[in-house]
């Protein structure tokens, strides 16, 4: 039996200093370019070496990005997320979702190490 | 590794059109993000245009917009830039410049040190 892949769902806030070179980082998403299916959200698509979000070290590939310094981004055409982002300002506040995969055994199976019984 | 040589530049009356053309070889031209950068006397070199394929975005400096139009020819392995209604302050060498096209779009401005693979330039001059 396969074990069932659950997902742990976390918000944060994160605060950006930008760059000499910006915030550092790309993004897909928009209701005109949808990258998940039925979802015109705003994706974290790479992190740049040396960025100022890699620096940080909280902002992932893959996080969903729900608001910049406090504007929603929900229904934005691709385009105006990115002049959202570019004209954010100095210190940006970024509202993420976080999408960890958990991985949980087959049902009636105690992993190696599980404290309990 | 990308070979980039440009061509077109010349000498023009103000309010004039030029074609500039950047041929690239080396690499597989689609994957690559290709822009415009120009570099006036005594002035720091700064982005003009920028043509993703892979992302369909392309960007345009506020100093061009209107005017310039960038775009490419995947078959031919070339990217274009039309000048329309040069003027003085458009006078620079231009160079064009490739760098690998990742997912997305940046959401910073274009910069040239995001770009690996550069031009040796070719001069515009409108008087």
């Known amino acids: 039996m396969n074990g069932r892949v659950d997902y742990l769902v976390t918000e944060e806030e994160i605060n950006l200093t930008r760059g000499p070179s910006g915030l550092g980082f790309n993004i897909v998403g928009g209701t005109d370019q949808q990258y998940v299916s039925n979802d015109s959200g705003i994706y974290v698509s790479r992190i740049k070496e040396n960025g100022a979000a890699a620096l940080d070290g909280r902002l992932q590939e893959g996080d969903k990005i729900l608001s910049v310094n406090g504007q929603d981004l929900k229904n934005l055409l691709h385009q105006d997320a990115v002049d959202l982002f570019r004209n954010a300002g100095y210190a940006v506040s970024l509202r993420v979702q976080h999408r960890l995969q958990v991985q949980n055994g087959p049902i009636g199976h105690r992993g190696e190490g599980d404290p309990s019984g | 590794h990308v070979q980039l040589v440009e061509s077109g530049g010349g000498l023009v009356q103000a309010g004039a059109s030029l074609r500039l053309s950047c041929a690239a070889s080396?690499?597989?031209?689609?994957?690559?993000?290709m822009a415009w950068f120009r570099q006036a006397p005594g002035k720091e070199r700064e982005f003009v245009a920028e043509d993703s394929w892979s992302n369909h975005r392309v960007w345009y400096s506020d100093s061009v917009k209107g005017r310039f139009t960038i775009s490419r020819d995947n078959a031919k392995n070339t990217v274009y830039l039309q000048m329309n209604n040069l003027k003085p302050e458009d006078t620079a060498v231009y160079y064009c410049a490739a760098d690998r096209d990742y997912s997305g779009s940046t959401v910073d401005p274009p910069n040239q040190s995001e770009y690996d693979y550069w031009g040796q330039g070719t001069q515009v001059t409108v008087s």
């Open positions: 080396g690499g597989t031209f689609s994957s690559y993000a």
